[in-house]
């Protein structure tokens, strides 16, 4: 059988997982584990929270974040924004790709009640060589990390 | 045109749908319809709730469950966990792959209020031949089945 | 190297984005932007809100809608249904493919509280040539559009 351009072995794909170091508190994007456990990179690169395309094309990109808290403490936004953003050589600013807004705190009927919520994003976007995709969560203090299964970030070429 | 390794026809894929028999109450994983309606298996096998890989590679696996209830009756967990888990010959225990925790009952402002919520999980994982993936929901009594469109489980090789 | 059937260049894929014209209030499906910004069609057609297959096969179809409101005004359903539906020459009615029900208003603890929620659907379905997939939201008045990143609809062949 003839070797074709898109075998399972070389189709770009990645799945990055949440880790203790994911939340920097610096206003930057979330950081991710790239090798341990369930995490891997195949035909995509990683740098400071970003998946970097090294082959142009359409990619299904996705991210899930696990949110949680106790009531809604003052100083925490009642709206949480979870988004995937693109960095490109063409523009200096990040471009919004896929974004969700949620108000999970409202689920707690008292200030002492524990609540959990999850936000999933996924969609097909075009990436050129060198373009980067990052995940941001505002307010990231509500992201709950554990073992890489609850918050993650990935992509594959379609 | 030469037949290549990854034509649309032979790329492993599956979509399994919720059915009346999905919820066993036995503490086991959810069970799924594999043939009727929207359900199908192509290059993957099924056994007792599990999708079974018969080709090694990276798969995008996904599941959605429809949750619902009336208020939050005592005895039901205020946190619902929905997860995809791997069974492998390498380890005796199931391995968590993708997990979400939600507190949907808190949406109901009174004990008599009907509430609905949905949990979606999806991500790329590596499966070896013979490895199995199952869906679990705790507490599964809050899963609302109807016609296979609201709760489902699927995968395809990327 | 021989040109194969599924190169990255010709694998059907699409991502359509929400626009001011998406919500018609006519009881029909949501309408979408197909060309501007992040939106594109590759090997799929579009007609009046529908993605139309011009190649038979299994497709991962997905949609996200951004929901939001202030309290839960009377006349708005407390349950929101977000679904993907198929139109086929074989049957006169639309067929439910993937559906979610949510009760996001319950998150607001008072009638004046702003709330946000997001609904994501994705799964693999079989489409014949000429079959169409549309997105419906009931009550669509709670869909919040902005710039195409918060509500969208897409597909790709697997």
């Amino acid at each position: 059988l003839i070797q074709e351009r898109r075998s399972h072995q070389n189709n770009p794909a990645a799945h990055l997982t949440g880790a203790n170091s994911s939340l920097t508190g610096s206003g930057g994007p979330l950081l991710w584990e790239t090798q341990l456990g369930l995490a891997f990179l195949r035909g995509l690169d990683y740098h400071d929270g970003a998946l970097v395309a090294n082959k142009a094309g359409y990619y299904y990109i996705y991210s899930k974040v696990q949110l949680g808290g106790v009531g809604c403490p003052l100083g925490l936004a009642s709206t949480i924004t979870h988004g995937l953003y693109k960095r490109t050589p063409r523009y200096p600013e990040e471009l919004e790709l896929l974004v969700s807004q949620q108000s999970p705190c409202g689920r707690a009927t008292s200030n002492s009640r524990v609540w959990w919520d999850s936000s999933f994003l996924g969609g097909v976007v075009h990436l050129e060589v060198g373009e980067e995709v990052v995940v941001r969560v505002l307010d990231e203090r509500l992201v709950r990390l554990r073992d890489g299964t609850r918050s993650y970030f990935g992509a594959f070429m379609v | 045109l030469i037949q290549e390794r990854r034509s649309h026809q032979n790329n492993p894929a599956a979509h399994l749908t919720g059915a009346n028999s999905s919820l066993t109450g036995s503490g086991g994983p959810l069970l799924w319809e594999t043939q009727l309606g929207l359900a199908f298996l192509r290059g993957l096998d099924y056994h007792d709730g599990a999708l079974v890989a018969n080709k090694a590679g990276y798969y995008y696996i996904y599941s959605k469950v429809q949750l619902g209830g009336v208020g939050c009756p005592l005895g039901l967990a205020s946190t619902i966990t929905h997860g995809l888990y791997k069974r492998t010959p390498r380890y005796p225990e199931e391995l968590e792959l993708l997990v979400s925790q939600q507190s949907p009952c808190g949406r109901a402002t009174s004990n008599s209020r009907v509430w609905w919520d949905s949990s979606f999980l999806g991500g790329v994982v590596h499966l070896e031949v013979g490895e199995e993936v199952v869906v679990r929901v705790l507490d599964e009594r809050l899963v609302r089945l109807r016609d296979g469109t609201r709760s489902y489980f699927g995968a395809f090789m990327v | 190297l021989i040109q194969e059937r599924r190169s990255h260049q010709n694998n059907p894929a699409a991502h359509l984005t929400g626009a001011n014209s998406s919500l018609t209030g006519s009881g029909g499906p949501l309408l979408w932007e197909t060309q501007l910004g992040l939106a594109f069609l590759r090997g799929l057609d579009y007609h009046d809100g529908a993605l139309v297959a011009n190649k038979a096969g299994y497709y991962y179809i997905y949609s996200k809608v951004q929901l939001g409101g202030v309290g839960c005004p009377l006349g708005l359903a407390s349950t929101i249904t977000h679904g993907l539906y198929k139109r086929t020459p074989r049957y006169p009615e639309e067929l439910e493919l993937l559906v979610s029900q949510q009760s996001p208003c319950g998150r607001a603890t008072s009638n004046s509280r702003v709330w946000w929620d997001s609904s994501f659907l994705g799964g693999v379905v079989h489409l014949e040539v000429g079959e169409e997939v549309v997105v419906r939201v009931l009550d669509e008045r709670l869909v919040r559009l902005r710039d195409g990143t918060r509500s969208y609809f897409g597909a790709f062949m697997v």
Partner: antibody, heavy 116, light 107 residues
């Protein structure tokens, strides 16, 4: 207008090191990805390395592990540290700005000669 | 790596001639192709990006076309300042690779 000026080239023995600089002006340097390209005497062009705004770096296989690209946005400067130089590294080295395509604007080049 | 080939490797033409240079990629690169002009002792100058888009300031006598694996650069009416070497370059996939060049000289 956009200007890129390379410097630091010269004669070096095999195994030696050299540091090239590229001074940028006429645009907001920190907003752009930057690249190095080289051209051996009488030969074609070869891409060497690039650095993104966020300082993600990519190298061609021929220089990986020996060359290091870096940038100093405060000084509007791009650098290429070249170690373990070989005869086949002899070339004119160009820096280029990446906007609509990877090599939209080029400097005039600086010659590196590796010879004993 | 993606290999880029150009033909012809050299050509002789007269002022006013219409000149076409072809570039072929070893695999599909969509429209991620750029063309450069280089004169002796000078740095390359970008002419075309995205296979057919003209760089700012480049005269419209230059045009590019093609997609996938086969591309062409056309100079509609050759002028004395156009005698140079022309390179194509793909940026669909790392590493970026250049064609070997086509030298256009005076007949």
């Amino acid at each position: 207008q956009v200007q890129l000026v390379e410097s630091g080239g010269g004669l070096v023995k095999p195994g030696g090191s050299l540091r090239l600089s590229c001074a940028a002006s006429g645009f907001t340097f920190s907003d752009y990805y930057m690249s190095w390209i080289r051209q051996a005497p009488g030969k074609g062009l070869e891409w060497v390395s690039y650095i993104s705004r966020s300082s993600f770096i990519y190298y061609s296989e021929s220089v990986k592990g020996r060359f290091t690209i870096s940038r100093d946005n405060a000084k509007n400067s791009l650098y290429l540290q070249m170690n373990s130089l070989r005869a086949e590294d002899t070339a004119v080295y160009y820096c280029a700005r990446w906007e609509l395509s990877p090599f939209d604007y080029w400097g005039q080049g600086t010659l590196v000669t590796v010879s004993s | 790596d993606i290999q880029m080939t150009q033909s012809p490797s050299s050509l002789s033409a007269s002022v006013g001639d219409r000149v076409t240079i072809t570039c072929r990629a070893s695999q599909g690169i969509s429209n991620y192709l750029a063309w450069f002009q280089q004169k002796p002792g000078k740095a390359p100058k970008s002419l075309i990006y995205a296979a057919s888009s003209l760089q700012s300031g480049v005269p419209s006598k230059f045009s590019g076309s093609g997609s996938g694996t086969d591309f062409t650069l056309t100079i509609s009416s050759l002028q004395p300042e156009d005698f140079a070497t022309y390179f194509c370059q793909q940026y669909n996939t790392y590493p970026f690779t250049f064609g070997p060049g086509t030298k256009v000289d005076i007949k």
